[in-house]
Every structure is written in C-alpha cells, then in structure tokens.
C-alpha cells in the first residue's frame, strides 16, 4: 500500500524490572525526512483534538525541547530509515504499548510496538530433541527471548546441579526480526544420564542467579545387565552344576525378551533370567552372557568364562618336524585337552618310558637315526592321568651309511680284462635311488649299483662309488691294481753325451715308463741277434762295425714290450783309402784316364787331396782325377788323401802307365 509508512521491528519485546530493552527498528517515510518524533506509552487517539494522548517517553521536536524521561529513553534512529530505541533501565510499568509518532513535512504515522516487562527475570526455555538415545550426540538448546546491549547476561548448563563440562555456544540476536539469547550444548548422553535433571540457568554478568529452566532427561538405552554366577569363579568339575543369574540394572524402555548366549551363539529354550547348567560337561566350557532386548536394541552382560575342569584326554604327539634330518633339532609336543592344564607329562619312545622327560615339550638338539620310532605321551593334572594316545612316528632321514666299493673280479686284474664293481651300503633313509662313480667313464651300469668296465685300461688306478638318496655318500676309493706289460720301452744313450766316435766307450740304457708287476727282464738285440740281458748295453771301444739298428725288450709276467729300433752311428776318420783307375792302370796316350779316391769314412769325406809320385800335391780336390788326353808323362805313382770332421786318411801309391799310341810309335 503506497499510502503507508513501512516499519520493521519485533512485534513484542520482553524484559524484566531493572533490565533494559533495546528495540531494533527501521522505517521508510512516505515523503521527505522525519521532522518530529514522539514516543508514547499506551497512546490513545483523541478524536476531538485529532491528536494522540498518553505518556510521552521521548520527544524530538523542531524547538529541541526534551523531557526529563529522555535520559532513560533514547532514540537511536535518524531522519530517514533508523528508528531504533533503547530504554534503560526498564520498569514494570513500561509494559504495554509503545507508540512511535512520526511526522514528516506532509505526512504523519503512529507505529505500535508491544513491550512485556515482568517483575522478576523470566526463565529461559530448554528445547530437547524429540528422542534421546545413549551415545548419540544431541544438541540441547536454551532460549531466552531477551537481549539488550546495556544488560549483559549469561546462560549456564547444569547436570544434577553440577556445571556441565561440555562447552556451550552462546549466540544473541538483536535484529528487526528477532531479539533473543540462545545457548546450545552438544552432548552425548550415556544410559546413566537417564532420569537426571538438566538445568539452564540465567545469570547476570556477575554470575548471580536470575532464573532457570529444568528438564528431566529421558535417555533411551538398551538394557544394562549384570551377570552373577555360582560358583563365583565359574570353575567347576565335570558333573557339577552352575547357576547364572542375569540382573537388569536399567532399561529404557522396558525390556521385552531375554536370552543366553554361549560363545556368541544363542542357547535354545533359555529365556529366563536364570540359566541352570546341571551336570556340566567339558563341552559346556566357554564364554556365557545374557542378552536382554528392548525397543532400542539388545543389551549384553559381561561375559562369564565357564571353565569345566576334567582329567586329560588321550594325548596326541605333534612332531616338529618329521621327517627329520640327522643332526637337526626336533621338538615333540604333547597335546592333551585338559582343564586345568596338565602339570606333568610322561614320554615314551617305542613304548619305553623316556627318563627325566616331564615337560609338555621334548627337545632333541641333535637327532640321530636311533631316535626314529614312535613317540607317545601321557598328560596328568590334579584330576587324574590321561591315556596314552596312538603316538606319532619320527622318521629320521640320513645319507647312506658305510658305503663301500667292492671289486667282484678274481684278482689280479689284467689290462684289457672286463671288471665288475658293486656299490654296497649298510643303511639308508630314504632308500638309495641312484649311484655315482668316480672317475667318470663310458662304462656300463648293467644294474643299479653295479659298474662294468670293459677292456680295463692299465691306468684305471682307483674307483669310488657313491650311494645317493636325498644326499650322496662316497665310499673310499678302491685300487683296481690293474696289471700290464711294461710301457713306453725305449733305447736311451747314456754315454758319450756327444756323438760316438770310433774307439769311444758307449753305454745304452733300456728305459720304460711303468710296469705292473714291477719285476722285469731285459733283452738287447741287433739285427735279430741277442746281445745281452741287462738294462744297459756297454761298448768299451766302439768300432764302426758296431754301428747298426739296436732294439731292447722288457718283459714281465703279463707280457713283453719292444722298443723302437735305435740306430747306432759311429764316427771315424777316412780309412781304407785306395786309388782306382779307369779304364785301368795302363792307358794309351791320348785317351782318357780317371783316378778315383775310394774310402770308408763317417761322416763321408768332405775334402780330397791328390799327390804324385814326387809327393807333389796336385791342384785337384774332388774324389775323381780325370786326365784327358792322358800323356806318357802322366805315367807314375799317385796317392790321395781324404779328410772329414774326424780326421784324415791316406791311400797307398797306385801306378798309372801311359804307353805310346801306334801313331807315335809309327812316327818314331
């Protein structure tokens, strides 16, 4: 409506005697600025005067006159939009209607605001959520329809008269829409808070009590239970009886059902607050609790651990670990269900009691093959002795023991024989699955653990075998002791160290590398002729005639072996020189005559010298001296000399006769 002034402010404001009131207010005049403002208390319109009558609490006019009340009442507004007011202190008789008479140049308006002032501070109001459940956070709200800048207040929360630990958040509102002070408290109630009194207390700035509001907490919670048991320690023996009683200490709302649980599983047909267990068995040992439900949910008591005591049950043995390897450690554990736990144990190995072993565990630090067998035990507690169970088998695994290599052949073994060996052992766990032989060869294994060596070599000295399961055990090597004829027979010159010269002392040695058996005989041979039976062949003074091809033989009981032929070479100076003439020692002049210097020498003659009958050396150095044409003057005695590295040799004289030819004779 464009003909109205527009105001915004709270409809009613609340306060109490001695406090103050702050009235937030805004307006919009129809035209121009505010020229006059009067605050009336309970104004009434006088039709006669066309004016408002009533107590004037505040007046602002053009002439500036201000009534005495103006100190208590303050107009905090302005000429065009703010109409905020403050009354401090406020009195009980201020209750009623406040009238704001506003006048501009051409328009007038009366705006009414309700003021409710009580004699004493009025209580705040606690607001609770519709339902409170244990452990679920709720917000408690304390609301007071009051706030004033000139009168500070505080709201405090109490639980059963004791200030609450939780921090509250206080907020105030002084707006044209609302005026209030609010405290919010976040709180997680427990079941024990059910029925407790919560108070919101209004206090002044000094903490002096002004008023309060109280509520009783209705905390919905699952039933809270206590379990009682006879016997109190819940330790019984088989055949005893046990009573458990479930007591509900609190439930909101009321409980509806009750049940009993053992180890988390519901017990059938047990729906009363007492659980009677008659003549209990060990199977009834376990954790018991009662469960009572209401609309919130189920509540459970603490658990009672029922222990039914009984003598040990037949025991079983656990072995860590079987099969065990010889030398390793093994632990035996005697397992027997018993309550109380067994205090004493008796251990048996293959039915025989193991002395001094009374613990639950038996530890053998170094296991040996004889430890194998059946282990059993008997457990004992205060209620009796259990039975011996079936026991457990300890399998001790070890490498094959006492492995030997055995030669099956009759002795001695000769080179070339077929040799059979077997690999034997004393015991093994697990069983032997394969065999190994050293040294390796292209040999036959006709069956497991048997080795056949065809055409055994002279050098097959030792053989060792291993029997293998998970491990290999080697036997000591066995000597084959193969017998064979002497080997590598050869002729070796012992002296002289250099070449053999005629007349030297010469020694030849018959060598061989090996022989088995060692006893041997020697034979020397030259051109098929036996020369001696010693290992050495000696020449005191060698002659060229001793040169030739020599062999030695070595024999033992197995056979004989010959050396390769060895050539004996004798070095000597030229000898047996002679001059031969061709075509003869008588030659016709004019013909050709050839003189040859023949010799025996080793090494062969390297240099020849010719001499005439006057011992005059001739200028010829080859083996042949050729005279062509021969002259009568050539007649005479000739000789030659041969030279090699050893020395010189000289021939006897040989006479050449040159006769005249018929022509010469004819001319004469």
């Amino acid at each position: 409506d464009s003909s109205k002034w527009v105001f915004e402010h709270p409809e009613t404001l609340y306060a109490w005697e001695g406090a103050c009131v702050w009235i937030p207010c805004t307006y919009r005049a129809l035209d121009g600025d505010l020229e006059s403002f009067i605050l009336f208390h309970n104004p009434e319109y006088n039709k006669n005067t066309s004016k408002f009558d009533g107590t004037r609490l505040y007046e602002s006019t053009k002439d500036g006159k201000v009534p005495s009340e103006q100190k208590r009442v303050q107009f905090l507004g302005d000429k065009n939009k703010n109409c905020t007011l403050s009354i401090h202190p406020v009195h009980l008789n201020d209750s009623g209607q406040l009238g704001l008479r506003m006048e501009s140049k051409t328009e007038k308006w009366m705006e009414r605001i309700h003021l409710n002032v009580s004699e004493r501070p009025f209580p705040p109001h606690i607001q609770l959520p519709p339902e409170i459940q244990e452990s679920q956070e709720v917000t408690l709200t304390c609301l007071l329809n009051f706030s004033c800048y000139g009168y500070p207040i505080q709201l405090q929360w109490l639980l059963e008269g004791v200030p609450m630990r939780q921090a509250a958040v206080t907020s105030t509102s002084l707006t044209i829409k609302s005026v209030f002070t609010r405290s919010e408290l976040k709180f997680s109630p427990q079941w024990s808070h059910h029925g407790k009194i919560v108070t919101c207390q209004l206090q002044d700035a000094d903490g002096k009590f002004l008023s309060n509001d109280t509520v009783q907490l209705n905390v919905k919670h699952t039933p809270k239970l206590e379990i009682k048991v006879t016997p109190s320690d819940a330790i019984v023996r088989e055949g005893d009886s046990v009573t458990m009683t479930c007591e509900v200490s609190s439930s909101n709302p009321e409980y509806t059902t009750v049940s009993w649980l053992k180890d988390g599983t519901s017990l059938k047909k047990q729906n009363t607050f007492t659980l009677n267990l008659r003549e209990v068995t060990k199977d009834q040992s376990g954790k018991y609790c009662c469960q009572v439900s209401n609309d919130v949910g189920p509540g459970r008591s603490e658990e009672v651990f029922l222990q039914v005591q009984y003598a040990p049950e037949p025991s079983t043995v656990q072995i860590l670990h079987s099969p065990a390897v010889e030398g390793s450690q093994v632990e035996f554990l005697c397992m027997s269900l018993a309550n109380p736990l067994p205090t004493n144990y008796t251990w048996y190995h293959n039915g025989k009691e193991m002395q001094g072993r009374t613990e639950e565990k038996v530890h053998i630090p170094k296991i040996l093959p004889w430890h194998a067998g059946t282990y059993s035990c008997v457990a004992e507690n205060i209620l009796g002795t259990g039975q011996r169970g079936p026991g457990a088998e300890l399998d001790v695994q070890y490498p094959p023991k006492k492995v030997t290599t055995v030669i099956q052949n009759p002795m001695p073994i000769r080179e070339g024989d077929t040799v059979t060996l077997s690999c034997n052992y004393n015991s093994s766990n697990p069983s032997v699955t394969r065999y190994e032989w050293k040294p390796h060869g292209a040999w036959e294994e006709p069956s497991l653990g048997v080795l056949k060596i065809q055409n055994v070599g002279w050098d097959n000295t030792t053989i060792a075998c291993a029997a293998c399961n998970s491990w290999c055990s080697w036997a000591s090597p066995v000597a084959l002791n193969v017998q064979y004829a002497p080997r590598d027979v050869r002729v070796r010159k012992i002296k002289p160290l250099s070449e053999i010269h005629s007349g030297n002392s010469v020694s030849l040695q018959c060598d061989f590398s090996s022989s088995h058996p060692k006893e041997v005989q020697f034979f020397w041979e030259k051109n098929g002729r036996l020369l001696g039976k010693e290992s050495q062949l000696n020449f005191d003074s060698i002659s060229p005639e001793d040169a030739g091809s020599y062999s030695c033989w070595v024999n033992n009981s197995i056979g004989q072996t010959a050396s390769k032929a060895w050539t004996l070479e004798v070095l000597y100076a030229p000898r047996r020189l002679r001059v031969s003439m061709s075509p003869g020692d008588q030659v016709m002049e004019g013909k050709s005559a050839t003189l040859t210097c023949e010799s025996d020498a080793n090494p062969p003659v390297s240099h020849y010298t010719w001499f005439d009958w006057n011992n005059q050396s001739l200028p010829y150095h080859s083996q042949k001296l050729r005279l062509e044409p021969v002259k009568v003057q050539h007649s005479g005695a000739y000789w030659c000399q041969g030279t090699n590295s050893v020395g010189k040799g000289r021939s006897p004289l040989s006479t050449l006769t040159v006769y005249y030819s018929p022509e010469t004779i004819g001319r004469r």
Epitope: P231, V236, T245, R278
Partner: antibody, heavy 127, light 112 residues
Framework: EVQLQESGPGLVKPSGTLSLTCAAS?????????MCWVRQPPGKGLEWVAC?????????YYATWAKGRFTISKDSSKTQVSLKLSSVTAADTAVYYC??????????????????WGQGTLVTVSS | DIVMTQSPSTLSASVGDRVTITCQAS??????LAWYQQKPGKAPKLLIY???TLASGVPSRFSGSGSGTQFTLTISSLQPDDFATYYC??????????????FGGGTKVEIK
C-alpha cells in the same frame, strides 16, 4: 500356596536315631531347586546341615561336620524330604528347619541361598 | 571350608538410624552372599542374595554391597519392624577349592 512343613519326634534319647520329614506343597521337584535342612541350637546361630537335588539325580550334599552321621533322602512321589541322624547326642538339640534353596553344586559341595523356610521343629535329645 | 565372620555381634540403634552390618569371608566368594533376618521363634527370612539383589517383597531401605571377601548390609532408616537378628551366608561353592554353604555368627540389632 507354596509351603514347607517339618515333622519329627520332638524328643530323642541319646545314641538313638532321629528321623525328620519335610512335606513340600506347591513345589515342583523336577524344577531347579534344592531341598535342604538347616538347624539352630537354642540361643545360637544357624548351621547348614545338608541338601538334596530333588530331581531324578537325587545328588546329596553335606556340611563337612555332618558327613557320615546325617543322611538326606527324598520321596519324589510324595514331594517329601527326610533327614536321618544316627547316634544323637545332647549337642544335636536344635530347631531343625526344612528350606527350599536356589543355587549350584558339584563334587560334594553346594552353594545356595534359602528363599523359602518351614516354621521349624524342635528336637530335644535327652534321656 | 569357608568361615564367615560377622560384626558387630550386637548393635544398639534407634528408629530412623542408618545401620551397617559387615560380613567377612575367609575366601574370595565373588558376589555369592545372602543376608537373612530372623525374629525370635520364627524361621529366617531371605533379604538379599548375590550380595546386592533384593529378594521379592523386601523394602528398599535394605541394601547390600561388596564382593570378594568384604560385604555390607545397610538399613538406610531403621524401622520398628527391623529389630531382629541378621545372618550372612556364603552361597558360593567351589569343587576346586573345596568349600560351600556357610553362615555367619549373626548380628542382633536391638533398641537403644
């Protein structure tokens, strides 16, 4: 109405045998109650004597001092419990109460509280 | 066997008084304790069992507390009908530790 009524001779000669009977009405002997005897010598305190499980097992329990001389038994058909005491002496003079008990027992020991009592019968041992 | 020791043996009190009777067990009996009231010439009456559970029909001025070996019976405001002798009794048992029912010697509450 659940009630217990004791009956007995009143006067017994020393070295004689005392026999007491407790008639139980409104009590289910198959339920988990024990039937017991408690005595009270004149001007003295209460002494528990013995209990019996009236259910089929009929297991009996005795105070250590009562073993051997007292015998508790039941007659389920009549819902009766009896107590016999041999070789009585003046020290056995007492008011003997029959009581219904609630609790547990085993291996000769019992733990129970007495929620229902008979009015008691006075037994005097005198020549 | 278990031995129950009550104290005091006699207690003088006035109507409206708060009365406390204690009972000590020679072994740990958990919460297995009962309290009885006996008036002259009458059979005992069960007041409390399991140390703190009120028997049916017993006024709430009677309360029990304790566990293990120390127990207390409290009458918050003594009434004329409460002058009597009170007995504690172990209703725990143990087949393992060999004990069962046992009564205390009694406490006589008389008018001061």
């Amino acid at each position: 109405e659940v009630q217990l009524q004791e009956s007995g001779p009143g006067l017994v000669k020393p070295s004689g045998t005392l026999s007491l009977t407790c008639a139980a009405s409104g009590i289910d002997f198959s339920s988990y109650y024990y039937m017991c005897w408690v005595r009270q010598p004149p001007g003295k305190g209460l002494e528990w004597v013995a209990c019996i499980d009236p259910a089929s097992s009929g297991t009996t329990y005795y105070a250590t001092w009562a073993k051997g001389r007292f015998t508790i038994s039941k007659d389920s058909s009549k819902t009766q419990v009896s107590l016999k005491l041999s070789s009585v002496t003046a020290a056995d003079t007492a008011v003997y109460y029959c009581a219904r008990a609630y609790g547990s027992g085993g291996s000769g020991y019992i733990g129970c509280y007495f929620d229902l009592w008979g009015q008691g019968t006075l037994v005097t041992v005198s020549s | 066997d278990i031995v129950m020791t009550q104290s005091p043996s006699t207690l003088s009190a006035s109507v409206g008084d708060r009365v406390t009777i204690t009972c000590q067990a020679s072994q740990n009996i958990g919460s297995g304790l009962a309290w009885y009231q006996q008036k002259p010439g009458k059979a005992p009456k069960l007041l409390i069992y399991y140390a703190s559970t009120l028997a049916s029909g017993v006024p709430s001025r009677f309360s029990g507390s304790g566990s293990g070996t120390q127990f207390t019976l409290t009458i918050s405001s003594l009434q004329p009908d409460d002058f009597a002798t009170y007995y504690c009794q172990s209703h725990d048992y143990s087949s393992v530790r060999s004990y069962g029912n046992a009564f205390g010697g009694g406490t006589k509450v008389e008018i001061k």
